[in-house]
Interface confidence: low
């Protein structure tokens, strides 16, 4: 039950996180014009990864895409790439995790397969979250660098003159959305990985004789038994022994839900 809850919660948290990463990537407010101590603002500017917008004092807003790749900073291109990789990985992770959910039955899918899929999606969510956090952080660093360079330019222009119209940019809402979304995706991924440990069947096949008490009788068969410590589903003293004579290799190939060690 706890495993299902952890897996489900991890899925939901990751879903919210990836939705946030997509929203942040599409938002225009990655950087906004810093209005502090700036008396010469004809329009309010804000930029996204894909377009630049101006809002006039009248309230009219116009946005224009970046038409050239040459004029944009390499860092911006890197941020775009990181965010897209994060979205793609997250989307694939979501798709995989849907089929991995314990509460969803698809044919006769073994728990081991679900465990592997849960781990895969968890790792994808972790990488997706890290990509988003890295992308947003790179952009924030680019802004901070630009901000302080602009501040220096404003007060130390040519011949000591004041550069009144040099605009400085500061953090936009998309950065905070990106950080939070990346963090949520990362947490969701970790939860999926934790859930995977609970789903993964581990077993020990003893080469020697294994005994398993079941009610009043004791079943005995050399080489065909699996040891159970009682941590799994076998709490009602059900017989694990199925009576079929199988080799050790065959037993290992087909783990059941009772195979907890």
């Amino acid at each position: 039950m706890a495993v299902t809850a952890c897996q489900g919660l991890g899925f939901v948290v990751s879903l919210i996180g990836i939705a946030g990463i997509i929203a942040a990537t599409c938002m225009d407010q990655w950087s906004t014009q810093d209005l502090y101590n700036n008396p010469v603002t004809a329009v309010f500017n804000y930029q996204g990864l894909w377009r630049s917008c101006v809002r006039e004092s009248s309230g009219f807003t116009e946005c224009r895409g970046y038409f050239t790749l040459l004029g944009l900073p390499a860092m911006l291109q890197a941020v775009r790439a990181l965010m897209i990789v994060g979205i793609v990985l997250g989307a694939i992770g979501l798709l995989v995790s849907i089929f991995a959910l314990k509460c969803i039955r698809i044919g006769s899918m073994e728990d081991s397969a679900k465990a592997n899929m849960t781990l895969t999606s968890g790792i994808m969510f972790i990488v997706s979250g890290l990509c988003a956090i890295a992308g947003v952080s790179v952009f924030a660093n680019m802004l901070v660098t630009n901000f302080w360079m602009s501040t220096a330019n404003m007060y130390t222009g040519m011949g000591g003159m004041v550069q009144t119209v040099q605009t400085r940019y500061t953090f936009g809402a998309a950065l905070f959305v990106g950080w939070v979304a990346g963090g949520l995706t990362l947490i969701g991924g970790v939860m999926m990985c934790i859930a995977c440990r609970g789903l993964a069947p581990e077993e020990t096949n003893y080469k020697a004789v294994s005994y398993h008490a079941s009610g009043h009788s004791v079943a005995y068969k050399p080489g065909g038994f699996k040891a159970s410590t009682g941590f799994g589903s076998n709490t009602k003293n059900k017989k694990i022994y199925d009576g079929g004579a199988r080799t050790e290799d065959e037993v290992q190939s087909y783990p059941s839900k009772h195979d907890y060690v």
Partner: nanobody, 123 residues
Framework: QVKLEESGGGFVQAGGSLRLSCSAS????????MAWYRQAPGKERELIAA?????????KYAESVKGRFTIFGDYAKKTLYLQMNSLKPEDTGVYYC???????????????WGLGTQVTVSA
């Protein structure tokens, strides 16, 4: 190619008036501010007037021109004006237009300068 071009300069008697214009051309997308600078012979370039949204509260002037000069802009036409009244001989100099412009090629607003227009005020 983004360009700022000043016009309206010339020779005027003290007490006269002039109106300077500064037109921005090229792939300009946004204007983050516009200003006029003056460079008198043998002196450093100094800010004389700057404008923001066009409201009186968002303009600033050097003390030497307050009450005589008026800066205003027509952002739709991407043009900045400087109306100069009650001109004095000390107003003589080259007047430069300065604007923070956003172009389709640049991510951030950058300051651009015009080549300047000469204003001569005779006593």
């Amino acid at each position: 190619q983004v360009k700022l071009e000043e016009s309206g300069g010339g020779f005027v008697q003290a007490g006269g008036s002039l109106r300077l214009s500064c037109s921005a051309s090229g792939s300009i997308f946004g204007i983050t501010g516009m200003a006029w600078y003056r460079q008198a012979p043998g002196k450093e370039r100094e800010l004389i007037a700057a404008i923001g949204s066009g409201s009186a509260g968002n303009t600033k002037y050097a003390e030497s021109v307050k009450g005589r000069f008026t800066i205003f802009g027509d952002y739709a036409k991407k043009t900045l004006y400087l109306q100069m009244n009650s001109l004095k001989p000390e107003d003589t100099g080259v007047y430069y237009c300065n604007a923070g412009l956003m172009t389709s090629q640049s991510y951030y607003s950058k300051p651009y300068w015009g080549l300047g227009t000469q204003v001569t005020v005779s006593a």
